[in-house]
């Protein structure tokens, strides 16, 4: 025979073709072998001009031989070489699919590989590629878009060889709250790390507000609206500054009375105050908390105390906010001016968390009267709020 060629090569099959001998022959003897593969020999009819090679090893160079037989006579042997394709990984699956994450898993191909090429694409045409190592059989996808169809494909690599791609299709789950109106909704969306988040007042995407979320204290989901920790920020500010907010939300800051009014107008909120001083801690929780609008001069409502710090906020309940340039307290003197801060002063305060940091003079410092009195300025203080029904929402999410 002559003109031995191979065609239709895959990772496990190939088709051998040849030109028949000029003389009539009884049979052809075909043999093929590869590195680490024992030789296989097959005899086929003398009028056959092709033979399907099966059960081949992937990514293997084979040597194929053929000769003709007629009675006791044998023709000379002709030879061809071919290399099977790299076989594909198997069983690509997307599991643990969340709103922004998914886990891809697969089984490795039979052939040894030098790595894998992962490609994932969303319906909007966003394509991302990543190459992972040869021993990897799973990969966590992150920063996905919620409620989005994705096609994930994987291809094995071995030097210049590339397998066929296999694919799987999955859809990320929708966010419970696409535009979270507070940190509790951000948390129910699956965000469990404390830090900066964007919330949307009344769930309106045009009303974005960057806030610091405390996702750890008492179950998390708190919008922090005041932090004192080192005295670097000046809290002896005017009415306009307290209305708008000031400071660095990762450090010392005040979120702003306008923001507090808008947030607490969204529903029933609770207040938590966390205090720390020289290794001691205390907290106060009020199950009803709201701040009125500018017309009420941001009137405070705070009721339903529990905690370890003592009920110092009750004294301030029903009071309007006061600053040195807008005196709304019930004292003859200006409380904000007298005590170098700002608060929902009455005459004057049991709480002065916006007082002078580190000032232990009577009533001048960061005070929470029923914990450390008026002659000790507290080192660390945070005020934060979340929906009063957060526990119910959290339980519902866990059941879901």
């Amino acid at each position: 025979p002559s003109g031995l060629v191979t065609a239709n090569i895959t990772d496990s099959e190939a088709l051998a073709r040849w030109q028949p001998a000029i003389a009539t022959v009884d049979s052809y003897v075909i043999s093929y072998t590869g590195e680490k593969v024992p030789e296989i020999t097959r005899t086929v009819s003398g009028n056959t001009v092709e033979y399907a090679l099966t059960d081949l090893e992937p990514a293997t160079e084979y040597t194929l031989r053929i000769f003709a037989e007629k009675g006791p006579q044998k023709s000379s042997t002709i030879t061809a070489k071919f290399t099977t394709d790299l076989d594909s990984p198997r069983d690509l699956t997307a599991t643990e699919v969340q709103s922004e994450t998914a886990l891809l898993t697969w089984r490795p191909p039979r052939a040894s590989v030098t790595g894998y090429l992962l490609v994932y694409e969303s319906v909007d045409g966003t394509v991302k590629e990543v190459i992972v190592g040869p021993d990897t059989t799973s990969y966590s996808l992150a920063d996905l878009s919620p409620s989005t169809h994705y096609t994930a494909k994987i291809q094995a690599l071995n030097g210049p060889l590339r397998s066929n791609m296999i694919q799987t299709i999955f859809t990320t789950i929708g966010l419970l709250y696409p535009f979270p109106k507070d940190c509790s909704q951000a948390m129910l969306n699956g965000d469990t790390t404390s830090g900066l988040y964007t919330i949307y007042l009344n769930g309106d995407k045009a009303e974005a507000l960057e806030v610091f979320c405390d996702m750890t204290s008492d179950g998390g989901g708190w919008i922090v609206f005041l932090r004192r920790k080192n005295g670097r920020e000046n809290f002896y500010q005017n009415w306009k500054a307290y209305a708008a907010g000031f400071g660095d939300r990762r450090e010392e800051f005040w979120l702003g009375l306008d923001n507090l009014n808008k947030i607490t107008a969204q529903g029933q909120y609770e207040l938590r105050v966390d205090l720390r001083d020289h290794g001691e801690t205390a907290f106060a929780v009020y199950d009803k908390f709201s701040v009125g609008d500018a017309k009420t001069r941001y009137k405070l409502k705070v009721e339903g105390y529990s905690g370890t710090a003592g009920d110092s906020m009750a004294y301030h309940n029903g009071r309007s906010f006061s600053t040195f340039d807008k005196d709304t307290d019930s004292a003859i003197t200006n409380c904000a001016l007298s005590y170098k801060g700002a608060f929902w002063y009455r005459n004057c305060h049991r709480v002065n968390l916006m007082g002078r940091y580190g000032d232990n003079n009577h009533s001048q410092g960061v005070n929470w009267f029923h914990w450390k009195g008026h002659e000790h300025s507290i080192q660390f203080a945070e005020m934060k709020l979340r929906p009063s029904n957060f526990r119910n929402l959290e339980g519902r999410r866990k059941r879901a």
């Epitope: 009920d311 009750a314 019930s330 005459n347």
Partner: antibody, heavy 120, light 107 residues
């Protein structure tokens, strides 16, 4: 209208017990801390005891600590003062009083008082 | 405990007189000071809270001032119904304490 009415006073021998009650009406009782204040005959006012709106926190003057117990039943809008081991110096007119807002605050509503006389 | 000292302990005045009663706290109490009026056989009545705020229904001839440790109750023009005993009270901390009282009688 807002009203406090005390009852339970009377003549009692030293060492014995007495329980005073105060019935409240006209306001949301459990929103407010309540106090007992006493006035010995011909003398000034002396704060005796106080209790938070929920009943979770209680406070006593040193002179009655360990002998008197303040309590409240918010379902019944009632305040109580259990007085044990009574002494002659406990003889006084006992008033219950409502605070304006917080535990330590002005007393804006007072009852008419109930007289306790400790004598053998 | 915070001691409250009132002066004078008694005073005689005529209708129309301006009367001033002072109250001193043994320690700094911001403006946590209240004034009460008590007539014989009656319960005390709140007049002034937070040192200077007039309780609802109290005539405007009564006024309060002061902060820190020194406080004053002033009756601008004494009326017949004002003859009574007046008490100051600190609500700064527990135990809340009262002054010993100032008796205002007719001259």
């Amino acid at each position: 209208q807002v009203q406090l009415v005390e009852s339970g006073g009377g003549l009692v021998q030293p060492g014995r017990s007495l329980r005073l009650s105060c019935a409240a009406s006209g306001f949301t009782f459990d929103d407010y801390a309540m106090h007992w204040v006493r006035q010995a005959p011909g003398k000034g006012l002396e704060w005796v005891s106080g209790i938070s709106g929920s009943g979770g926190s209680t406070y006593y003057a040193d002179s009655v600590k360990g002998r008197f117990t303040i309590s409240r039943d918010n379902a019944k809008n009632s305040l109580y003062l259990q007085m044990n081991s009574l002494r002659a110096e406990d003889t006084a007119l006992y008033y219950c009083a409502k605070v304006m807002s917080s535990m330590e605050d002005a007393f804006d509503i007072w009852g008419q008082g109930t007289m306790v006389t400790v004598s053998s | 405990d915070i001691q409250m000292t009132q002066s004078p302990s008694s005073l005689s005045a005529s209708v129309g007189d301006r009367v001033t009663i002072t109250c001193r706290a043994s320690q700094y109490i911001q403006g946590f000071l209240n004034w009460y009026q008590q007539k014989p056989g009656k319960a005390p009545k709140l007049l002034i809270y937070d040192a200077s705020n007039l309780e609802t229904g109290v005539p405007s001839r009564f006024s309060g001032s002061g902060s820190g440790t020194d406080f004053t109750l002033t009756i601008s023009s004494l009326q017949p119904e004002d003859f009574a005993t007046y008490y100051c009270q600190q609500s700064y901390s527990t135990p809340q304490t009262f002054g010993q009282g100032t008796k205002v009688d007719i001259k």
